[in-house]
Interface confidence: medium
């Protein structure tokens, strides 16, 4: 809770604040971990402390490390750290994992990016704007105050976005960037009760004996993201896992897919060397969320080998 | 050195309102915050809620929300806690305590308030 | 709601004896758990804060540890001075006390 991750790229400017929870009123001391060193309040040095900021105008690799804060009262004292990374700057366009603040969701109705840490900053507007590394363009984005807003969202619109503005401090500039993830989401979802599309209600499959056999349970949910929704085979009315023959497996893990904008998930049962008593058993595929279960049941005949009409 | 000092032992009717003060000395009441604990006779300890004097900002534990107040008067540097709709369950030992938003470290002496018909 | 579940509700041990209460709350809640003692007719006291870190003044045979949701207040070496009710307080969301572990010399 009072220790914090800070990173930011060398010859930018970074300000990182002091994790814990201080008044304005409150002294703050700052050094620097490693070697109890105090960090200097004179502005004049390139990493220097302002009460709840430490700041690093610019930032270069050799200043990563972990930095304590401790907030005084005249009741207390009470310590904070600040682990920060600098990283040397990428050559291609790329932004790693490692610089990314937390993704954002936006929808149509909402489409809001907020430039994260900024508030830390004195800077002034405009802000620049970057997807993918290029300069965003055209009438659909608007740099307002901290936020970026996108008009009309599109799935498209998905993506990197990467907030690039000037601090100022004592009359010189330093640049910050900060990028951050933004992801669509459907606003328009909703769930229903659950729709096998395959296989049909009694459904006789014909297979042959000694082969291999695949039978696909799938099933639509509703549109957008669901949650609680699970499609899975029965044999005999028991789960795969406890019937106990090792040749019927279900495929592991849940193909989810997007059918004309509905969310959709499937299973396939395999069933290696088929045999006769495979044909006694009954074959249920199962559906469920949280409006209720539909079963589909699916039996198999045998096919003859030089039966070869379709 | 620092010192929190509570006004006397009270006793009141069921349904009355009790309030109860805190004065500080040795430290500006709004360079803290300022919490208010409760405790029952031969029981345990039970926070009440948070002042932060400086910008009135306060925040009540479920169980006594709506029926206590907190305040701070930054001029005299003295918290007040304010409980009504009295019952025989709230005979107790009132604590006020400063400290920072997430513990007490310094405490008054307490202030009994027995309610009795 | 944050739940404290603290335990023992009561101990009797030896002086010089190596003494733990214990805290276990039903959400992770990071380090922001605090212990306090109150002796008999006493006002309660911060012994250790956030933790792990001892206040000063405090005698260095308390300590405290654990992480997420549970928690632990050690007593290296009873001394009779000791004898005391010690509470846990969480404060990740609002602040609750435990139920209190009233502590006597045998």
């Known amino acids: 809770k009072f220790s914090k991750q800070s990173w930011g790229l060398e010859n930018e400017a970074l300000i990182v604040r002091c994790p814990r929870q201080g008044k304005p009123s409150y002294t703050v001391d700052w050094y620097y971990s490693q070697t109890n060193k105090s960090i200097p309040t004179q502005e004049r040095n390139r990493v220097f402390a302002s009460g709840q900021l430490l700041k690093f105008l610019p930032a270069a690799v050799a200043d990563s490390g972990i930095y304590t804060c401790i907030v005084r009262s005249p009741t207390f004292n009470r310590t904070g750290y600040a682990n920060v990374t600098i990283y040397k700057k990428q050559s291609d366009c790329n932004v790693p994992d490692y610089l990314m603040y937390s993704t954002v969701s936006g929808s149509e109705k909402n489409s809001k990016i907020y430039c994260p840490t900024i508030d830390l900053y004195n800077w002034t507007a405009p802000l620049e704007w970057f997807k993918n590394c290029q300069a965003l363009q055209g009438s659909r984005y608007r740099a307002h105050k901290s936020f970026l807003v996108i008009d009309n969202v599109m799935t498209e619109d998905a993506g990197d976005y990467t907030c690039k503005f000037i601090h100022n401090e004592n009359g010189a500039n330093y640049s910050v960037t900060a990028t951050r993830s933004f992801t669509v989401k459907d606003e328009q979802g909703f769930s229903l009760f659950p729709v096998i599309g395959a296989p049909a209600q009694n459904e006789i499959k014909e297979v042959e004996i000694g082969k291999n056999a695949n039978l696909t349970c799938s099933a639509c949910f509703g549109k957008g993201t669901q949650f609680l929704a699970a499609v899975l085979w029965q044999l005999n009315g028991t789960k795969i896992t406890d019937f106990g023959e090792p040749r019927i497996q279900q495929e592991e893990g849940q193909n989810q897919s997007f059918s004309n904008g509905l969310a959709c998930l499937d299973m396939v049962l395999r069933i290696a060397d088929v045999k006769e008593e495979d044909l006694l058993l009954q074959y249920d595929c199962l559906a469920l969320n949280l409006h209720g279960l539909r079963r589909h049941t699916v039996r198999l005949s045998r096919k003859n080998p030089i039966d070869h009409h379709s | 050195e620092v010192q929190l000092v509570q006004s006397g032992a009270e006793v009141k009717k069921p349904g009355a309102t009790v309030k109860i003060s805190c004065k500080v000395s040795a430290f500006n009441i709004k360079d803290d915050y300022m919490h208010w604990v409760q405790q029952a006779p031969g029981k345990g300890l039970e926070w009440m809620g948070r002042i932060d004097p400086a910008i009135g900002n306060t925040e009540y534990a479920e169980k006594f929300q709506g029926r206590v107040t907190i305040t701070a008067d930054t001029s005299t540097d003295t918290a007040y806690m304010e409980l009504s709709s009295l019952r025989s369950e709230d005979t107790a030992v009132y604590y006020c305590?400063?400290?920072?938003?997430?513990?007490?470290?310094?405490w008054g002496q307490g202030t009994l308030v027995t309610v009795s018909s | 709601d944050i739940q404290m579940t603290q335990s023992p509700s009561s101990l009797s041990a030896s002086v010089g004896d190596r003494v733990t209460i214990t805290c276990i709350t039903n959400t992770d809640i990071d380090d922001v758990i605090h212990w306090y003692q109150q002796k008999p007719g006493k006002v309660p006291k911060l012994l250790i804060y956030?933790?792990?870190t001892l206040r000063p003044g405090v005698p260095s045979r308390f300590s405290g540890s654990g992480s997420g949701t549970d928690f632990t207040l050690t007593i290296s070496s009873l001394q009779p001075e000791d004898v005391a009710t010690y509470y846990c307080l969480q404060s990740d969301n609002m602040l609750t006390f435990g139920q209190g572990t009233k502590l006597e010399i045998k």
């Open positions: 956030e933790g792990n």
């Open positions: 305590a400063t400290g920072d938003f997430y513990a007490m470290d310094y």
